[in-house]
């Protein structure tokens, strides 16, 4: 599903890839929300920004597929697929699979839901961030 | 208590155009599930034809096959599926059903919920 | 194209009897499948979902098992009551699957 290794991309492909995960994150959380009663847990830590935070690796893009593609077995909103496609055009292709167990009770399922796409829109706003700042500092 | 009510079915020519309605009652259109309309022709088993999601996306998902004829849309203000049916064929005749599905592995099956159907009839 | 092949397509047995039925994904579903009974004129009925989970009022005589792309549903004791015919389907949407159903299995009076 990789159609162009992620060195191809120039920065300004990454940052409107990064602005609509960005997008696709709120709309997830909005959904997530939804289900009331649920609260974020300290459980689960999804991982964002890399140590440079540099173009093209800003953000941890293998590992948030990963913590992604497990939130996809759990539930099919059909905009999870679309993050796992953003995801995938950020990826080399050589990156190595992140583990991540399911969890099995049915409410920890859900805060795992709740926390992961909360810290994914998080991460988005920051990565976003990074990059916007980053191209200010380069035109300077 | 969550009910599913289709509506719009009769008899129509072939080439004729339908516009089934799938009315909502006892909950309301928030987020986090699927409204998909089956099919099941005389004698014959359930079929799949199109779902939309109730949520941030009108997502919307057809069986190969229904593509291009068949169109789906809601009206959050009324509560109501649509499914529009263009250039009727006689194979088309079936019992139309609407159905809500959860999207989330983990709900519990209150989230499973189907109507009563409507019966379509094709023929000259 | 995805598909779920459920077999037999049909099936004669007596009350008492224990009855299995099979549901082969073409690629896997990670246990987004339900199992439905369906007399003639009603619509179905939720048996089985999330591939073991038994719904609500349906007697402990059915169960479900499986996962990735093989699933079973079975009746251990049949009942008179029974007689209809059973239908797998995946609600596992979006993605390359879809919503589909098996072909049915018709179970009737030996």
């Known amino acids: 599903s990789h159609t162009l290794p992620v060195h191809f991309l120039q920065p300004s492909d990454i940052q409107k890839i990064v602005e609509e995960l960005q997008s696709l994150s709120k709309m997830l959380l909005k959904d997530v929300k939804e289900d009331k009663g649920v609260l974020v847990s300290q459980n689960y830590t999804l991982p964002c920004l890399t140590p440079d935070a540099q173009p093209p690796n800003i953000i941890h893009s293998p590992a948030i597929r990963a913590y992604l593609k497990t939130i996809r077995q759990l539930d099919n909103k059909s905009v999870i697929d679309e993050i796992i496609e953003h995801l995938d055009k950020l990826i080399f292709q050589d990156a190595p699979e992140t583990n991540i167990s399911v969890p099995t009770d049915t409410h920890e399922c859900k805060r795992f839901i709740l926390t992961i796409s909360q810290q994914f829109s998080e991460c988005m706003d920051l990565a976003l961030k990074s990059l916007t700042s980053g191209a200010q500092q380069a035109t300077t | 208590q969550s009910q599913l009510v289709e509506s719009g079915g009769g008899s129509v020519q072939p080439g004729g155009s339908l516009r089934l309605s799938c009315a909502a009652s006892?909950?309301?259109?928030?987020?986090?599930?699927?409204i998909c309309w089956v099919r099941q022709a005389p004698g014959k088993g359930l079929e799949w034809i199109v779902c939309i999601y109730i949520g941030s996306r009108a997502d919307t998902y057809y069986a190969p096959w229904a593509k291009g004829r068949f169109t789906i849309s809601k009206d959050n203000s009324k509560n109501t599926v649509y499914l529009q049916m263009n250039s009727l064929r006689a194979e088309d005749t079936a019992t139309y059903f609407c159905?809500?599905?959860?999207?989330?592995?983990?709900?519990?099956?209150?989230?499973?919920?189907w109507g009563q159907g409507t019966q379509v009839t094709v023929s000259s | 194209a995805f598909q779920l092949t459920q077999s037999p397509s049909s099936l004669s047995a007596s009350v008492g009897d224990r009855v299995t039925i099979t549901c082969q994904a073409s690629?896997?579903?990670?246990?987004?499948l339900a199992w439905y009974q369906q007399k003639p004129g009603k619509p179905p009925k939720l048996l089985i979902y999330?591939?073991?989970k038994l719904a609500s009022g349906v007697p402990s005589r059915f169960s479900g098992s499986g996962s990735g792309t093989d699933y079973t549903l079975t009746i251990s004791s049949l009942q008179p009551e029974d007689f209809a015919t059973y239908y797998c389907q995946t609600y596992y949407g979006g993605g390359h699957i879809g919503w589909g159903f098996g072909t049915g299995t018709k179970v009737t009076v030996l």
């Open positions: 006892g909950f309301s259109f928030s987020a986090n599930y699927w």
């Open positions: 159905a809500r599905f959860s999207s989330g592995i983990y709900d519990l099956d209150r989230f499973f919920l």
């Open positions: 999330q591939a073991s």
């Open positions: 690629q896997s579903i990670d246990s987004w």
